[in-house]
Interface confidence: low
């Protein structure tokens, strides 16, 4: 990946909009298509004020762990969807787009150096375990995807890119 492409806000915005389109196509979280089993996903909640005061290395750990779990979750959803009778074409398309998007974002973050922090996180003994929740519909899964990109990922890349510019 070209160096620091993730620092161009339009790149991340494209993936966020794709994620929101996927959420919209699933017809709402109450009545939309359900997953045949619950899938573990990262909790996207972010305490803005606490996050803002975290070291960028600590943010990187949370982002990387969340991205890994999210990738596993969407791959799991793809497998469940493949085993279902008559999977809707549009849903399949958005799952494929999400998988492709997460792979691209993972590559872009590697260039930014986020995975280095996971290998040797600061104060590893004190690092809080990643909070998780479960998704039982495709809508909830895509909402978590969208919220993760708009939340922790966007906040982290904004700060990491600012640091890199100094």
């Amino acid at each position: 990946a070209p160096p620091r492409l993730i620092c161009d806000s339009r790149v991340l915005e494209r993936y966020i909009l794709e994620a929101k389109e996927a959420e919209n196509v699933t017809m709402g979280c109450a009545e939309g298509p359900r997953l045949s089993e619950n899938i573990t996903v990262p909790d996207t909640k972010v305490n803005f004020y606490a996050w803002k005061r975290m070291k960028v290395e600590e943010q990187a750990v949370e982002v990387w762990q969340g991205l890994s779990l999210l990738s596993e979750a969407i791959l799991q959803a793809q497998a469940l969807q493949a085993n279902s009778s008559q999977p809707p074409e549009s849903l399949q398309l958005h799952i494929d787009k999400a998988i492709s998007g997460l792979r691209s974002l993972t590559s872009l973050l590697r260039v930014l150096g986020a995975q280095k922090e996971l290998m040797s996180p600061p104060d590893a003994t004190q690092a809080a375990p990643l909070r998780t929740l479960t998704a039982d519909t495709f809508c909830k899964l895509f909402r978590v995807y969208s919220n993760f990109l708009r939340g922790k990922l966007k906040l982290y890349t904004g700060e990491a890119c600012r640091r890199g510019d100094r």
Epitope: N47, R53, G151
Partner: antibody, heavy 127, light 108 residues
């Protein structure tokens, strides 16, 4: 139920300092889960967020770019209130000033939602 | 600086659906809130995080946000819904941005 009670003068002379206070009941100004904001509203500028103060092991603040050089928001833990000071005011600063509480911890965005507001204080800047 | 644009006014008949829009560059990538303000009163939060309702806000109020536009939808409009409505978003680290406001008039 959180309540915010505002007080301060309604008339300030140009070049002087605008000072307002917001007394909190139902919560603590030094709560680790809340943030305390000032927002103003005028016909010419609409609603305008001015700044925030919050406590997370120590005190932090953030101010709007438009007033950064003139604004100070301070806590008063003994009285459970917080104050706004805006220096070197001009008639452009004439507005209804509101204090408001926001709560962090939801999906990103929720911490900015102003769920509780004071009633507002009309401040006129005039000689 | 970031700008949120709202129509100055929207009119709707009682019982019908009102839609108030808020547009900004790539607004769908930010979170949007909506506030209702009646004359002489402080604003009241009716929607946060694009589409969530605080407790006490009727289900008739809903929100969405995609692309460049966020929309506040009020179904089965009542006379008591007549007010000014403001969208807001935190588009940067420190600044909250409010839209210019939309006056909702309930006809009849």
């Amino acid at each position: 139920q959180v309540q915010l009670q505002q007080s301060g003068p309604g008339l300030v002379k140009p070049s002087q300092t605008l000072s307002l206070t917001c007394a909190i009941s139902g919560d603590s100004v030094s709560s680790n889960t809340a943030a305390w904001n000032w927002i103003r509203q005028s016909p010419s500028r609409g609603l305008e967020w001015l700044g925030v103060i919050y406590y997370r092991s120590k005190w932090y603040n953030d101010y709007a770019v438009s007033v950064k050089s003139r604004i100070t928001i301070n806590p008063d833990t003994s009285k459970n209130q917080f104050s706004l000071q805006l220096n070197s005011v001009t008639p452009e600063d004439t507005a209804v000033y509101y204090c408001a509480r926001s709560v962090p911890g939801g999906d990103p965005g929720l911490e900015h939602a102003f769920a509780y507001w004071g009633r507002g204080t009309l401040v006129t800047v005039s000689s | 600086s970031y700008v949120l644009t709202q129509p100055p006014s929207v009119s709707v008949a009682p019982g019908k659906t009102a839609r108030i829009t808020c547009s900004g560059d790539n607004l769908g990538t930010y979170y949007v809130e909506w506030y209702q303000q009646k004359p002489g009163q402080a604003p009241v939060l009716v929607i946060y995080d694009d589409s969530d309702r605080p407790s006490g806000i009727p289900e008739r109020f809903s929100g969405s946000n995609s692309g460049n536009t966020a929309t506040l939808t009020i179904s089965r409009v009542e006379a008591g819904d007549e007010a000014d409505y403001y969208c807001a978003s935190f588009a940067s680290w420190s600044d909250s941005v409010f839209g210019g406001g939309t006056k909702l008039t309930v006809l009849g």
